[in-house]
Every structure is written in C-alpha cells, then in structure tokens.
C-alpha cells in the first residue's frame, strides 16, 4: 500500500507512518514503529500538557510568586496550567497575570464607579454636581451633598466635588 501523506485526528506522521499522539497529561517517550505503539508517560508533579501531543517534555506549571503579589487561584493538574491571581488589594498587570500592582485609589473629587477585582483596576468617575468625595479611596463612591432643607437648615457654604455643603440655622427676621 501507498505510505500515508496525512493521518487521522490524534495521530501524527513520521517516516511515512501514522503514530498515535499522546493524550493530554502525557508526554512522548518513543514514536510508534510498524510493530509497536507510541509510548507515552504521565507528566510529573508540577508539570502539564494540555493538548494531544508529541512533546518529549511536559511544561512546568506557572509559579505564582508571592513576591510579585501573586497567589494561586486554581492549582494546575497534569492537563492544565496553574492560574494565578493577585492578593487582595492588588490586580494583574496583564491578562497572563505575571505580576500585580496596587489597586488605584480615586482621588478627592472622584468616586469609585467600579471596585477593582483580581484582574481589573479600580474605575473612578468625577463626582457630578450634587455629589462629593473628600478622601482618596479604592472603595468609596461619591456621596450626595447633605440636604440642608430636610434638617430645616440653610446652605451656608456651597458644596463642591470635594466638599460637602455647610448647613446653618435660618436667619430669623426680627420684628
């Protein structure tokens, strides 16, 4: 018969013959021959291969370096890599999450629109008219100005995006 030029799924072509690929979690030890099957061995501890493959070495699991603010989100298996995320208060600098930076704080005059997660930074927004923030915070939203009227008081000092209004007693007109 004619030697094959292409092989079935989960096979590979070597020296005009089709050999079985190794399943995920296993590495290639030796190619098949006309008499013997492909031989594969499981990846070792802290190693993985996530596809049908003919790799002779497994990949090392990612190391979540605590010195870079990383921690393990999901432990790797023989078929999957370790997934890292950042410690509380930090977020990844990239999708691969190779290092972390502190969550950004929203300056006075800005409030938190969206609190940071392990993978996304804090999203800030300017405090609109009627709202203020007088602190630098990664959690605080803009607060509404105090309503002097509901306290039967009057505005003595107007609020800004960084300060609350100052309320005071109403001036009584004397007869």
């Amino acid at each position: 018969p004619e030697p094959p030029t292409a092989c079935r799924e989960k096979q590979y072509l070597i020296n005009s013959q089709c050999c079985s690929l190794c399943q995920p979690g296993q590495k290639l030890v030796s190619d098949c021959t006309e008499f013997t099957e492909t031989e594969c061995l499981p990846c070792g501890e802290s190693e993985f291969l996530d596809t049908w493959n003919r790799e002779t070495h497994c990949h090392q699991h990612k190391y979540c370096d605590p010195n870079l603010g990383l921690r393990v989100q999901q432990k790797g298996t023989s078929e999957t890599d370790t997934i890292c995320t950042c410690e509380e208060g930090w977020h990844c600098t990239s999708e691969a999450c190779e290092s972390c930076v502190l969550h950004r704080s929203c300056s006075p005059g800005f409030g938190v629109k969206q609190i940071a997660t392990g993978v996304s930074d804090t999203i800030c927004e300017p405090c609109p008219v009627g709202f203020f923030s007088n602190v630098s915070s990664a959690f605080e939203k803009c607060h509404p100005w105090t309503s002097c009227e509901t306290k039967d008081l009057v505005v003595q000092q107007a609020g800004t995006n960084k300060t609350d209004v100052v309320c005071g007693p109403q001036d009584r007109l004397r007869a």
Epitope: I14, N15, Q17, C19, V29, S30, D31, C32, T33, E34, F35, T36, E37, E39, L41
Partner: nanobody, 117 residues
Amino acid sequence: EVQLLESGGGLVQPGGSLRLSCAASGFTFDSYAMGWARQAPGKGLEWVSAIGAKGLSTYYADSVKGRFTISRDNSKNTLYLQMNSLRAEDTAVYYCAKAARGKFDYWGQGTLVTVSS
C-alpha cells in the same frame, strides 16, 4: 556511537531454550523501541519481536507467539529474547535492532542460533 552487541546464541536441541541478550550503548536506551529480527540460511530477514521504549507495547510474529518473550532492562541498557520450545525452523542469525523516528535504523552484528539434534 551507537553499538548493539548480541550474545547468547548457540547450538540447542529441538524443544530446548535459549536466552539472547543485546547490550546497547551510545544512546539513551530507555527512549527507543527495540526489536529482534532473524535471517535463516538462504532466506530474507524476518521480524521476530519488538518492544516499546518503556516495555508498554510488544509485538510477536505469528511463528513465535507463545514461545518467545521479549523484555528489556532499561537500568542495564539490555534487550532480551527468551526463546522456549525451539524448533529446527528457528535456526537463523538473530539481530538486535534499535528504532528511531519510527524506523529500525541500527543493527547489531547478529548471533547464530542453531536448533538441531
């Protein structure tokens, strides 16, 4: 340099047993499939048996099934062929072979097995 050195051949009576050895050197023995082939006087090369790198996969020619056993000791870089219930038609020069990239590419010098009464 790859070297394959067969030993254990000799004269044996029909029904007898022999154990052939193949000492390998010059390559990482436990990374390659190995095999035995034979050539009887005036005949072509016949594959007898083969074994995967870790011994997980074996092959036997129909003519030797149930009588011959292939094995390997990767710690000693040695391939074996245990031959029982030998017959006159097993008389041949037996060659040890190493596979690479799916083909048997290195051969030993051979050891002669003679089965005769």
